[in-house]
Interface confidence: low
C-alpha cells in the first residue's frame, strides 16, 4: 500500500488566524476532524470538495476544518483573529515565483515574456488548442493565467490573445532568484522552501521523517515558520531538514543580496582597539591569543582544520590572523598556530570602558573600592540603585550604601568568591568580574570565627517521599547527554538545577545536551515509567579554577517516587575525617561485561595533610578541595563520573561534599580522589538559584 | 607509536579482546580510532573513544563491538564474534581529541573467526 | 549518513604518468578529507589531510585539491613504488547528522604501475 504523503509541508501556517468571507457566494465546506495534516491531505486532493481548495482552517477547540476556494489576497474576504484558529494557505497560490520548471506554479501572473495579454484557457480565440481545463485537472487552468501543465522546459506559458503569436513563455522568476540573504543568512526569514537540490524542507514543528530539537515554541526568535530554509546554528548558510527519509538535511540554494549590508538589529558595535560585550564586534589586530602564541590564518587549514573560514562567515570579518567572535563564543578567540593547542581566547583584548584603578583585591574583596565595571564575560555593570531590591533578597543585613556607588564591582553580600555586580541581561543577573586577590594575600576566605567547626548538615532529616525512600535513594543522580549519549554524572540540587563539572561541555552548542532523570540504567532500559528527558537550558561557571557548572534545566524537573534532590551542605563545613561516603556514576567500571547500571564506590574523608602524603608531596590541597579514600584498592571515581557527586551523611543527612572532576586518575590504588569542595562554593549556589530566573513548572 | 595485539583464531561466538598500546603521547590529549579490513577488502571504520572517554559507533557496529581505555591501552571488545568478523584490525590516533584525521596507525592485528 | 564513493577502483598507468583518483562527499564536508596509501600487507599511511595539506615526508608528486562535496588526488611522475590502494576519509561532524556516524572511508582505488 502506498503510503500517503503528508501536505502540510505546502501550506503557509498563519496562527490565530481566520478567513471571513464578506462576498455571500463564496463557497466554504467543513467537516470535524483530528488534525490540521487531515485538512491538508483533503485540500490537496481536492477530495469530495465541490471546488479548487486554495486554503482552510483549522478550528483546534471543535476540532474542524473550513476548506475554501480563495485565500487571504482574494477578493470579498478578510482575515480576521481567532485564538482558536489557525490558517494555512496552499503556498502554490500565494506564491509570485517559479520552483524548477514551474510545474506547481498557480499564481496570477497573466502576461507573457514580451508584454501579450495571455488567451483564457477555456476560450479559442484566437487560438485553438487541447489545453482545456476539464481535460488537465489539478493544474489549475483558470482564467488566462500563466501555467506549466505538462512541466515543459521554458518554465508556465499561455497561449497569447495576439493572432500572431500562438504561445509564449511568461516572466516568471525563479524563486531562488527572488530570495535572497545577508552575510550566512542568520537572520534570513524568507520563504524559500526547498533544497539546493530541489527536495521540500520539513516543517519545523514537526518530528517526521526527521526527529529533531529544532522546534519553534523552543526558539522563538529563530523564525522557524512553516518549513522555510533558516540558519539557527551559524551555518555558512540557511538550511533545512528534508522530507525525503534517506536525506535528513540539506542547504537552500539562497544567494546572497546585491547590497550585503545587514539589518541594524544585527550589527554588533565594531571596536578595534578593545571589547565590547562578548566582542563580536571586534575589529581590531591582535593576533595572539593571552599567553602570546600566534593565530592561525583563518584562511589556513594548518595546523588545524576548521570550517569558520571567510567564505563561510562572509561578514565576520575573518581577515589574516585576527582575533575574532564568529560564533557567539565568550570572546574573541582564534585558532593557534601551536599544533598541540587548537583554540584560545585572545583575554588580553581589554574591555572598553574598563578603567584599571585598583585591580586586585585583599580576602574575598569586600572592602574593594576599585571603579572596575565590567563582569569577567564582558558585560557592563548596571546600577547599584536599580537593583536594590534584589540585593535585600539575598542579604539579610543593610548594605553599605556608601561603598555601593555608580556600577562599580563590589562585594556587599561578602561572597567568598571577590568583586561582583548586577548586569543589564535578564539572563545573567549578576556576574563576578575579572578581579583577582592580590599577590601575596593570605587572608582566609572562609571566615568562621563564633564556629570554628560547623556541622555541614542542615538540621533537617533525610527527605523521603511519600514515606517510602527513593530507588535506593539515587533521585539526585543526573545523566548528562552529549548527542544522545551519556558523557558525564550530575546532582539535581533543585528542580531546575543541576550541579556538574565545567570539563563535561566540549560543544558550546546547548542543543547537543540533556539531562535524563530518574534512571538507574545508563540507556534507560527498564527506567520507561520513571526517565525525565530535559533540556539544558543555560550553563552557569562556577568562579574562576571551580571547575563547576550550574546547569539550568529548560523546565523544572518533576519530582516523585524516582527524581528527588540532594542537600547542599552549610557553606564553610567540616566534615569529620573517616566519615563514610559514597561516589556515584555510569563511567567505565573496569569491567569487561559493563551492563549499565549505576555503580556506587565507598570512600571515607581524609584530612587534606594526609590526602597530599599519600599522593607523595605532590599535590597540595587548598580550601576549595576535599579528599576521599577508597577503603577497597581501585575502586573510586573514573571517565563518565565526572560532573557526578561525593555523597556523605552526617546526621542521618544525605548531602552532596564534592563534586568529581578529571585530572586525578583513574581510582589509582592508594591514591586518595580530590573532590571539588562543595561547601566551599555553597554560598554561590544558593545565590545562583535566588538570583537566577528559572521556568515554572 | 600505537601497536595492537590479541589477534588469534576464534570460534564465533567466542568473545574477543583486542589491545592498542600507545607509547610517546597521552590519551589524555588523543582520541584512539578502531579500523578493520576484511581480506581484499577496503578500510572500514569501527568507532572513536574521545580523551573524555566518551565512544561514538559506526552505525553498522554500535552493540556489536565495545571500545574502553585506561591510560596507555585501549581495547576493542567482541563478544560475539562471527565469520564476517574476520579481518585485520588496527588502531589508529587521531589528530587530536575529537572528529580528525588518522595520524598513526599500528600495524595490524588479524583476527580469523572459524569453526 | 554521509557516503563517501570513490571513482575508480581500479586504474592502471605508466611509470612516469599521471593517475587522478576522485572522492565524492554525499554532503558537504567543507575541507575535512584526507587521503591514506595503503601496500598489501601493511598499515595504511596518512598522505593528505585538509584536502589539500601533504602529511610530514609526503613527496611533492602527490596533491589532493577540492572542497565541500568533489575532492581529488593526483599522482604525477608515478614511481613504481606508488603501486598501492589508495583510501580518501571523511572527518567532518555534523551536529544535524543523525546521531548514528558513518563508515568514513571511500571503498578504495588500486594503481597499477606499468
Known amino acids: 500500500q502506498r503510503k500517503r504523503r503528508n501536505t502540510i509541508h505546502e501550506f503557509k501556517k498563519s496562527a490565530k488566524t481566520t478567513l471571513i468571507k464578506i462576498d455571500p457566494a463564496l463557497k466554504i465546506k467543513t467537516k470535524k476532524v483530528n488534525t490540521a495534516d487531515q485538512c491538508a491531505n483533503r485540500c490537496t486532493r481536492n477530495k469530495g470538495l465541490p471546488f479548487t481548495c486554495k486554503a482552510f482552517v483549522f478550528d483546534k477547540a471543535r476540532k474542524q476544518c473550513l476548506w475554501f476556494p480563495f485565500n487571504s489576497m482574494s477578493s470579498g474576504v478578510k482575515k480576521e483573529f481567532g485564538h482558536e484558529f489557525d490558517l494555512y494557505e496552499n503556498k502554490d497560490y500565494i506564491r509570485n515565483c517559479i520552483i524548477g520548471k514551474g510545474r506547481s506554479y498557480k499564481g496570477t501572473v497573466s502576461i507573457t515574456k514580451s508584454g501579450i495579454k495571455c488567451q483564457p484557457w477555456s476560450s479559442m480565440i484566437p487560438h485553438e488548442h487541447s489545453f482545456l481545463p476539464s481535460s488537465y485537472r489539478g493544474k489549475d487552468l483558470q482564467e488566462n493565467y500563466c501555467r506549466n501543465p505538462r512541466g515543459e522546459e521554458g518554465g508556465p506559458w499561455c497561449f497569447t490573445s495576439n493572432p500572431e503569436v500562438r504561445y509564449e513563455v511568461c516572466d516568471i522568476p525563479q524563486c531562488s532568484e527572488v530570495e535572497c540573504m545577508t552575510c550566512n543568512g542568520e537572520s534570513y526569514r524568507g520563504l524559500m522552501d526547498h533544497t539546493e537540490s530541489g527536495k521540500i524542507c520539513q516543517r519545523w514543528d514537526h518530528q517526521t521523517p526527521h526527529r529533531h530539537k529544532f522546534l519553534p515554541e523552543r526558539y522563538p526568535d529563530k523564525g522557524f515558520d512553516d518549513n522555510y530554509c533558516r540558519n539557527p546554528d551559524g551555518q555558512p548558510r540557511p538550511w533545512c531538514y528534508t522530507l525525503d527519509p534517506h536525506t535528513r538535511w540539506e542547504y537552500c540554494a539562497i544567494k546572497t543580496c546585491a547590497d550585503n549590508t545587514m539589518n541594524d538589529t544585527d550589527v554588533p558595535l565594531e571596536t578595534t582597539e578593545c571589547i565590547q560585550g562578548q566582542g563580536e564586534g571586534y575589529r581590531g589586530t591582535v593576533n595572539t591569543i593571552w599567553n602570546g602564541i600566534p593565530c592561525q590564518r583563518w584562511d589556513s587549514q594548518y595546523p588545524h582544520e576548521h570550517d569558520m573560514t571567510p567564505e563561510n562567515f562572509k561578514c565576520k570579518d575573518l581577515r589574516e590572523n585576527y582575533c575574532r567572535n564568529p560564533d557567539g563564543s565568550e570572546s574573541p578567540w582564534c585558532f593557534t598556530t601551536d599544533p598541540n593547542i587548537r583554540v584560545g581566547y585572545c583575554s588580553q583584548i581589554p574591555n572598553c570602558d574598563m578603567s584599571h584603578g585598583q585591580d586586585c583585591y585583599r580576602g574575598n574583596g569586600k572592602n574593594y573600592m576599585g571603579n572596575l565595571s565590567q563582569t569577567r564575560s564582558g558585560l557592563t555593570c548596571s546600577m547599584w540603585d536599580k537593583n536594590m531590591e534584589d540585593l535585600h533578597r539575598h542579604i539579610f543585613w543593610e548594605p553599605d550604601a556608601s561603598k555601593l556607588n555608580e556600577n562599580y564591582c563590589r562585594n556587599p553580600d561578602d561572597d567568598a568568591h571577590g568583586p561582583w555586580c548586577y548586569t543589564g541581561n535578564p539572563l545573567i543577573p549578576w556576574d563576578y568580574c575579572p578581579i583577582s586577590r592580590c599577590e601575596g594575600d593570605t587572608t582566609p576566605t572562609i571566615v568562621n570565627l563564633d564556629h570554628p567547626v560547623i556541622s555541614c548538615a542542615k538540621t533537617k532529616q533525610l527527605r523521603v517521599v511519600n514515606g517510602i525512600p527513593t530507588r535506593t535513594n539515587i533521585g539526585w543522580m543526573v545523566s548528562l547527554r552529549y548527542r544522545n549519549k551519556h558523557i558525564c554524572g550530575g546532582s539535581l540540587i533543585k528542580e531546575s538545577w543541576v550541579l556538574t563539572a565545567r570539563q563535561c561541555f566540549p560543544s558550546r552548542d546547548l542543543k547537543d545536551y540533556e539531562a535524563w532523570l530518574g534512571i538507574h540504567d545508563v540507556h534507560g532500559r527498564g527506567d520507561e515509567k520513571c526517565k525525565q528527558v530535559l533540556n539544558v537550558s543555560q550553563l552557569v561557571y562556577g568562579p574562576e579554577g571551580s571547575d563547576l557548572v550550574l546547569m539550568k534545566l529548560a523546565r523544572p524537573a518533576v519530582l516523585d517516587d524516582f527524581v528527588s534532590t540532594i542537600d547542599l551542605p552549610n557553606y564553610g563545613c567540616t566534615i569529620p575525617e573517616k566519615t563514610s561516603c559514597s561516589v556515584y556514576g555510569w563511567g567505565y567500571t573496569g569491567l569487561i561485561n559493563y551492563d549499565g547500571l549505576l555503580r556506587v564506590a565507598h570512600l571515607y574523608i581524609m584530612g587534606n595533610e594526609k590526602c597530599s602524603q599519600h599522593h607523595r608531596g605532590k599535590v597540595t590541597l587548598n580550601e576549595s578541595e576535599i579528599c576521599a579514600g577508597a577503603e577497597k584498592i581501585g575502586s573510586g571515581p573514573c571517565e563518565g563520573d565526572y560532573g557526578g557527586p561525593l555523597v556523605c551523611e552526617q546526621h542521618k543527612m544525605r548531602m552532596v561534599l564534592g563534586v568529581i572532576v578529571p585530572g586525578r586518575g583513574c581510582a589509582i590504588p592508594n591514591r586518595p580522589g580530590i573532590f571539588v569542595r562543595v561547601a566551599y562554593y555553597a554560598k554561590w549556589i544558593h545565590k545562583i538559584i535566588l538570583t537566577y530566573k528559572v521556568p515554572q513548572s | 607509536s600505537v601497536e595492537e595485539s590479541g589477534g588469534r583464531l576464534v570460534m564465533p561466538g567466542t568473545p574477543l579482546t583486542l589491545t592498542c598500546t600507545v607509547s610517546g603521547f597521552s590519551l589524555s590529549s588523543n582520541a584512539i580510532s578502531w579500523v578493520r579490513q576484511a581480506p581484499e577488502k577496503g578500510l572500514e571504520w569501527i568507532g572513536v573513544i574521545y580523551v573524555i572517554g566518551v565512544t561514538d559507533y559506526a552505525s553498522w557496529a554500535q552493540g556489536r563491538f565495545t571500545i574502553s581505555k585506561t591510560s596507555t591501552t585501549v581495547d576493542l571488545k567482541i563478544p560475539s564474534p562471527t565469520t564476517e568478523d574476520t579481518a585485520t584490525y588496527f588502531c589508529?590516533?587521531?589528530?587530536?581529541?575529537?572528529?580528525?584525521?588518522?595520524?598513526?596507525w599500528g600495524p595490524g592485528t588479524l583476527v580469523t573467526v572459524s569453526s | 549518513d554521509i557516503v563517501m564513493t570513490q571513482t575508480p577502483s581500479s586504474v592502471e598507468a605508466a611509470v612516469g604518468g599521471t593517475v587522478t583518483i576522485k572522492c565524492q562527499a554525499s554532503e558537504n564536508i567543507y575541507r575535512l578529507l584526507a587521503w591514506y596509501q595503503q601496500k598489501p600487507g601493511q598499515r595504511p599511511k596518512l598522505l593528505i589531510y585538509s584536502a589539500s595539506t601533504l602529511a610530514s615526508g609526503v613527496p611533492s608528486r602527490f596533491k589532493g585539491s577540492g572542497s565541500g562535496t568533489q575532492f581529488t588526488l593526483t599522482i604525477s611522475d608515478l614511481e613504481c613504488a606508488d603501486a598501492a590502494t589508495y583510501y580518501c576519509?571523511?572527518?567532518?561532524?555534523?551536529?544535524?547528522?543523525?546521531?548514528?556516524?558513518?563508515?568514513?572511508f571511500g571503498g578504495g582505488t588500486e594503481v597499477v604501475v606499468k
Open positions: 589508529a590516533r587521531v589528530y587530536d581529541s575529537g572528529w580528525n584525521h588518522f595520524n598513526l
Open positions: 576519509q571523511n572527518y567532518y561532524y555534523s551536529s544535524r547528522s543523525s546521531y548514528d556516524t558513518y563508515n568514513v
